[in-house]
């Protein structure tokens, strides 16, 4: 079982990322943590999206990862896509640093990330409250801005 | 106040290894990314590498791959550069620095550590 | 790597006096461009960080500009105490680089 993971996050323009992963156990929680510069100030969705095929760009990586068929939700709500992380607050620098805990993503079994596509998105993500369908899709996060395969790291 | 206190100079023969140690305080360790830094004597600075301590991950200059070796004890909030098999031109000081995160600068320094490697 | 080149290298100014430093960066880096001052025996101190951003503390006589591949830092009306060394770096990708150095004298 692989216990690190590494994602480059590279987009058409400014933004780009590293992000790691760490899980100690293979039921225990991930933690992601890293950073991600070239982004208006306030908050991005931040969500694992199904494949890792970036192709024709982060729109190949298709929808958000969700093993389960649910709705998408914030990353504490148990009605949530696997690949639901949540916002990344960016600074007035336009630099996000990212230090999440999340227990329903791995890095082994169903709920595996590794090959799959990391996405940072346009806007913030209403977290499946924004009272439209697109909300219980993508939590109206607009385009992606920047993306990458999550990998297996040393 | 973030503060960085670095072991005390160094003499070493050349061939030797030496061991620096860099202990923060005033923040929470694990968010901190520490570099080392080092400057030789009238020269300018060089960036040998860093570590993430919260995961243990370490990358280093091309120049410095295979030589040193960074190391971090969460326990004690310090963080260790080793630098193996000495030579003359390794005559500097050493500073550790910290930045907040990936892409941002350092804004913490360490008082400096001189080592010396002469025979 | 990303080469950053800093010019003069060295500099023999008056107090009061106005001084320009310019950093190129061999290839764009955006905005990851920070500034630092060292007196002799002392460690480097952040000045500018994100090319034109004081850090808390610095006086506003310090100011930088630029993005992409060119960088200035400013000193305006300098003072006896600016005497130092003056080092830009660039933290937009690994290694992470530094210019030579800018050593200003104070005549």
């Known amino acids: 079982m692989a216990t690190k993971a590494v994602c480059v996050l590279k987009g058409d323009g400014p933004v780009q990322g590293i992000i790691n992963f760490e899980q100690k156990e293979s039921n225990g929680p991930v933690k992601v943590w890293g950073s991600i510069k070239g982004l208006t100030e306030g908050l991005h969705g931040f969500h694992v999206h199904e494949f890792g095929d970036n192709t024709a760009g982060c729109t190949s990586a298709g929808p958000h990862f969700n093993p389960l068929s649910r709705k998408h939700g914030g990353p504490k709500d148990e009605e949530r896509h696997v690949g639901d992380l949540g916002n990344v607050t960016a600074d007035k620098d336009g630099v996000a640093d990212v230090s999440i805990e999340d227990s329903v993503i791995s890095l082994s079994g169903d709920h595996c990330i590794i090959g799959r596509t990391l996405v940072v998105h346009e806007k913030a993500d209403d977290l499946g409250k924004g009272g439209n369908e697109e909300s219980t899709k993508t939590g109206n996060a607009g385009s992606r801005l920047a993306c990458g395969v999550i990998g297996i790291a040393q | 106040q973030v503060q960085l206190v670095q072991s005390g100079a160094e003499v070493k023969k050349p061939g030797s290894s030496v061991k620096v140690s860099c202990k923060a305080s005033g923040g929470t360790f694990n968010n901190f990314v520490i570099g080392w830094v080092r400057q030789a004597p009238g020269q300018g600075l060089e960036w040998m590498g860093r570590?993430?301590?919260?995961?243990?991950?370490?990358n280093y200059a091309q120049k410095f791959q295979g030589r040193v070796t960074i190391t971090a004890d969460k326990s004690t909030s310090t963080v260790y550069m080793e630098l193996n098999s000495l030579r003359s031109e390794d005559t500097a000081v050493y500073y550790c620095?910290?930045?907040?995160?990936?892409?941002?600068?350092?804004?913490?320094w360490g008082q400096g550590t001189l080592v010396t490697v002469s025979s | 790597e990303i080469v950053l080149t800093q010019s003069p290298d060295f500099q023999s100014v008056t107090p009061k006096e106005k001084v320009t430093i310019t950093c190129r960066a061999s290839?764009?880096?955006?905005?990851?461009l920070h500034w630092y001052q060292q007196k002799p025996d002392q460690s480097p101190k952040l000045l500018i960080k994100y090319a034109s951003q004081s850090f808390s503390g610095v006086p506003s006589r310090f100011s930088g500009s630029g993005s992409g591949t060119d960088f200035t830092l400013t000193i305006n009306s300098l003072e006896a105490e600016d005497a130092a060394a003056y080092y830009c770096h660039q933290s937009s990708s690994l290694p992470i680089t530094f210019g030579q150095g800018t050593r200003l004298e104070i005549k």
């Open positions: 620095a910290r930045t907040g995160n990936y892409y941002k600068p350092y804004d913490y």
């Open positions: 570590i993430i301590p919260i995961l243990d991950i370490a």
């Open positions: 290839q764009s880096i955006g905005s990851s």
